[in-house]
């Protein structure tokens, strides 16, 4: 966990609040050149396990909009365009950090939250269970 | 931008810091049951575009450990186990929020940062450029 700071020049926190609460600068530093998965790639359409992106919107959260991938098929798309049901399209999930407004009506107070999002889909060989 | 709150019961921020700085409670609320990409599924092994997970560690960042997917092949794995180079294994990327310690050694002061991570791989039909 994060502990009570003793560094000079660091913002101080009261012992009773710490280690729960920290100060976060919202001037986001963006380490990416392109932030657009749809424009930077059209993998969602070209994949053998194509997916659609659905919007998940919540004004009490930052980011307030998260895009969720939903696989288009149960199976995977073959070269001829038909779906092969001997293979499975499955969502690739990622746990991400979001900021949740807490208390709800306070615009500058947040709680860190982890949520699981589906980022895209991949084609996998199914696990076959043989019955004796 | 975000401005000085006047709501009673909300943490206050000094004008000089606001709208840049907010309070964040680090007691993470986890809406998920499993947090390990390797344990939650073995898609990385069963995919026709399999990947390896590489550990990206940075003690000045929260989360300090992020798992990066690296596709194992340029092509995609066929049913017979051979690689089909007429198809491409490509990484599915997602922009995520992390907290970066700033100033660097201050444990309770952070800056929000966006980074692009590869979550897994998917098999896509290549874009063929025809030369006149």
């Amino acid at each position: 966990g994060i502990a009570i700071p003793r560094n000079s020049g660091c913002p101080n926190s009261e012992d009773k609040n710490f280690p729960r609460t920290v100060m976060v600068n919202l001037n986001i530093h963006n380490r990416n050149t392109s932030t657009n998965p749809k424009r930077s790639s059209d993998y969602y359409n070209r994949s053998t396990s194509p997916w659609n992106l659905h919007r998940n919107e919540d004004p009490e959260r930052y980011p307030s909009v998260i895009w969720e991938a939903k696989c288009r098929h149960l199976g995977c798309v073959k070269a001829d365009g038909n779906v092969d049901y001997h293979m499975n399209s499955v969502p690739i999930q990622q746990e991400i950090l979001v900021l949740r407004r807490e208390p709800r009506h306070c615009p500058n107070s947040f709680r860190l939250e982890k949520i699981l999002v589906s980022v895209g889909c991949t084609c996998v060989t199914p696990i076959v269970h043989h019955v004796a | 931008g975000i401005a000085i709150p006047r709501n009673s019961g909300c943490p206050n921020s000094e004008d000089k810091n606001f709208p840049r700085t907010v309070m964040v409670n680090l007691n993470i609320h986890n809406r998920n049951t499993s947090t390990n990409p390797k344990r939650s599924s073995d898609y990385y092994n069963r995919s026709t575009s399999p990947w390896n997970l590489h550990r990206n560690e940075d003690p000045e960042r929260y989360p300090s450990v992020i798992w990066e997917a690296k596709c194992r092949h340029l092509g995609c794995v066929k049913a017979d186990g051979n690689v089909d180079y007429h198809m491409n294994s490509v990484p599915i990327q997602q922009e995520i929020l992390v907290l970066r310690r700033e100033p660097r050694h201050c444990p309770n002061s952070f800056r929000l940062e966006k980074i692009l991570v590869s979550v897994g791989c998917t098999c896509v039909t290549p874009i063929v450029h025809h030369v006149a």
């Epitope: 919202l26 986001i28 963006n30 932030t35 657009n36 998965p37 749809k38 992106l53 919007r55 919107e57 004004p59 930052y62 980011p63 307030s64 909009v65 895009w67 009506h105 615009p107 | 931008g1 975000i2 006047r6 709501n7 922009e95 966006k114």
Partner: antibody
Framework: EVQLVESGGGLVQPGGSLRLSCAAS?????????MCWVRQAPGKGLEWIGC?????????DYASWARGRFTISRDNSKNTVYLQMNSLRAEDTAVYYC?????????????WGQGTLVTVSS | DIQMTQSPSSLSASVGDRVTITCQAS??????LAWYQQKPGKAPKLLIY???TLASGVPSRFSGSGSGTDFTLTISSLQPEDFATYYC????????????FGGGTKLTVL
């Protein structure tokens, strides 16, 4: 300086079409913003038309009355958002504002342009 | 669509007066309401968001309150520069996002 500048307004005949532009400066279109259009008929109130996401995904929202006749698009390389208006009617005469919604708080418009006047008349 | 009913539509007052403008939503919008000030020939200017949070640079004589369906904008002591038209604006999301504005309140000198 962070600002929005609209252009493309003018006189158009009923049934005609017009494309308005909104050039953003001082910030870059990204996943942090939604770019919107709001109009105001002479002596009347403000009316939301629609918004387009400036990052990640091609996604738009429209007021129910605007869907079909009005189309919002963007060119991120030019940091510009557009409003294509078709089958224009006299009641579309208004000042058209470009406005920004910050992804940090999507509940309000945090930046407005100065507006461009569109007059629909024969 | 959610209807935003603003009242009064016009209001006359004097410098130093306390003024209250109300906005009612046709269904609950939590506290997702903003207030704007608009002067003739100018774009709207954000005053308050999330029902009660003062926007950057806005004088403290402006305040907002309310949640659910009923909201209020109060100017504690009118200044000459406050004579303008005021609009409330809501945010709503169901299957898609929408924003709506109240009809406006024109504040003039008595």
């Amino acid at each position: 300086e962070v600002q929005l500048v609209e252009s493309g307004g003018g006189l158009v005949q009923p049934g005609g079409s017009l494309r308005l532009s909104c050039a953003a400066s001082g910030f870059s279109f990204s996943s942090d913003y939604w770019m919107c259009w709001v109009r105001q008929a002479p002596g009347k109130g403000l009316e939301w038309i629609g918004c387009i996401y400036a990052g990640d995904v091609d996604d738009t929202d429209y007021a129910s009355w605007a869907r079909g006749r009005f189309t919002i698009s963007r060119d991120n390389s030019k940091n510009t958002v557009y409003l294509q208006m078709n089958s224009l009617r006299a009641e579309d005469t208004a000042v058209y504002y470009c406005a920004r919604v910050d992804g940090f708080d999507i509940t309000y418009f945090d930046l407005w342009g100065q507006g461009t006047l569109v007059t629909v008349s024969s | 669509d959610i209807q935003m009913t603003q009242s009064p539509s016009s209001l006359s007052a004097s410098v130093g007066d306390r003024v209250t403008i109300t906005c009612q939503a046709s269904q609950t919008i939590n506290y997702w309401l903003a207030w704007y000030q608009q002067k003739p020939g100018k774009a709207p200017k954000l005053l308050i968001y999330r029902a009660s949070t003062l926007a950057s640079g806005v004088p403290s004589r402006f305040s907002g309150s309310g949640s659910g369906t009923d909201f209020t904008l109060t100017i504690s002591s009118l200044q000459p520069e406050d004579f303008a038209t005021y609009y409330c604006q809501n945010y709503y999301y169901s299957t898609s996002r929408s924003y709506g504005f109240g009809g406006g309140t024109k504040l003039t000198v008595l």
